[in-house]
Amino acid sequence: MGKGDPKKPRGKMSSYAFFVQTCREEHKKKHPDASVNFSEFSKKCSERWKTMSAKEKGKFEDMAKADKARYEREMKTYIPPKGETKKKFKDPNAPKRPPSAFFLFCSEYRPKIKGEHPGLSIGDVAKKLGEMWNNTAADDKQPYEKKAAKLKEKYEKDIAAYRAKGKPDAAKKGVVKAEKSKKKKEEEEDEEDEEDEEEEEDEEDEDEEEDDDDE
């Protein structure tokens, strides 16, 4: 989606992204020749971010605000190439990606946050839910993890059956070009999944089937 357009404004960066970028630059200065273990580096950054005070985070939040303003300004004048606005074909009958344990937890506690802080932005609600999840003991996370695992299992069966049948409309519409490599296909599916989860965030939680799990 517009990945190839060099004129497209660079996406806006979050305060955490700016922080990570700064960490990376610091690391490069200190160890110019060292190769970075990405997962270890990410973990260290995340730990540092968690312990930082609001004051310390402030400068990164200011950078993010400025970048958001830049992005919005540039997007106003940006004209996408023809056909670019069209979303990738998504079969409405395809099984929906299962929610994560954290997502299930959010569905449960979002009313609490919204009820106590009615004016909170979506981002701040998410932040508070993240804090709550971090404060939830492993024992209390278990029911959500169990349910998420159950839903994941079901999804894997459903997606296997769905793929076995073949994406129905896709072939008819001539969307399927040459056979893509498995890796490329998986990457695209992951992207779709991420989109699905973002869309699901906004959906009401009412249709969530409940397990009467004994803890």
Epitope: R110, N135, D140, D205
Partner: antibody
């Protein structure tokens, strides 16, 4: 004002049933874990049961498992405890409490309690 | 289940003196992921429901006088009343919320000497 008010206690014979209610007000009931805690006369506190905000997850003390059922009606801001096959050792003051789930898990708001006496 | 044991069972302290209550859990209630102790302290006065005093082992609930303080980590915890007042006469309970079932200590009765 944040408040919890229990009702439904009373005298019941061994083997009998009772349904306790707890009416919540002053907070977003549907966003909180709720619990029942009991206290036998002259004794300490005993956790009985808990229920998740949506009602999908429940937990019970071994002493009441299979006999007691916790439930909630978020549209009525009410918590329930259905007590069946009651025994003399179930005699206690039953408190409903709000569990500050996710924020700190402790029981921060308590009702005044309702007395349940199981005796023939 | 995590067992909670309080000591002493009862305590008589002069007004203005320090009162110390201990609580021991049968296993650690410290969650390594966030370095928090899942332990609370409650005060119960005769004929009243319990009242939350301390959570996270050492964080005072809002409105609780600062003469009440909590300390400890892992399995050993302490509630201290720095200068006992007449209105502090009550039974004090520790409680773990690290795992289900939630469990309470047997209680410590604080009286005035």
């Amino acid at each position: 004002e944040v408040q919890l008010l229990e009702s439904g206690g009373g005298l019941v014979q061994p083997g009998g049933s009772l349904r306790l209610s707890c009416a919540a007000s002053g907070f977003t009931f549907s966003g909180y874990m709720m619990v029942w805690v009991r206290q036998a006369p002259g004794k300490g506190l005993e956790w009985v049961s808990r229920i998740s905000p949506s009602g999908g997850q429940t937990g019970y003390a071994d002493s009441v498992k299979g006999r007691f059922t916790i439930s909630r009606d978020n549209s009525k801001n009410t918590l329930y405890l259905q007590m069946n096959s009651l025994r003399a050792e179930d005699t206690a003051v039953y408190y409903c409490a709000r569990e500050e789930g996710g924020s700190y898990g402790a029981f921060d708001i308590w009702g005044q309690g309702t007395m349940v006496t199981v005796s023939s | 289940d995590i067992q909670m044991t309080q000591s002493p069972d009862s305590l008589a302290v002069s007004l203005g003196e320090r009162a110390t209550i201990n609580c021991k859990s049968s296993q650690s209630v410290l969650y390594s992921s966030n370095n928090k102790n899942y332990l609370a302290w409650y005060q119960q006065k005769p004929g009243q429901p319990p009242k939350l005093l301390i959570y996270w082992a050492s964080t005072r609930e809002s409105g609780v006088p600062d003469r009440f303080s909590g300390s400890g980590s892992g399995t050993d915890f302490t509630l201290t009343i720095s200068s006992l007042q007449a209105e502090d006469v009550a039974v004090y309970y520790c409680q773990q919320y690290y795992s289900t079932p939630r469990t309470f200590g047997q209680g410590t009765k604080v009286e005035i000497k």
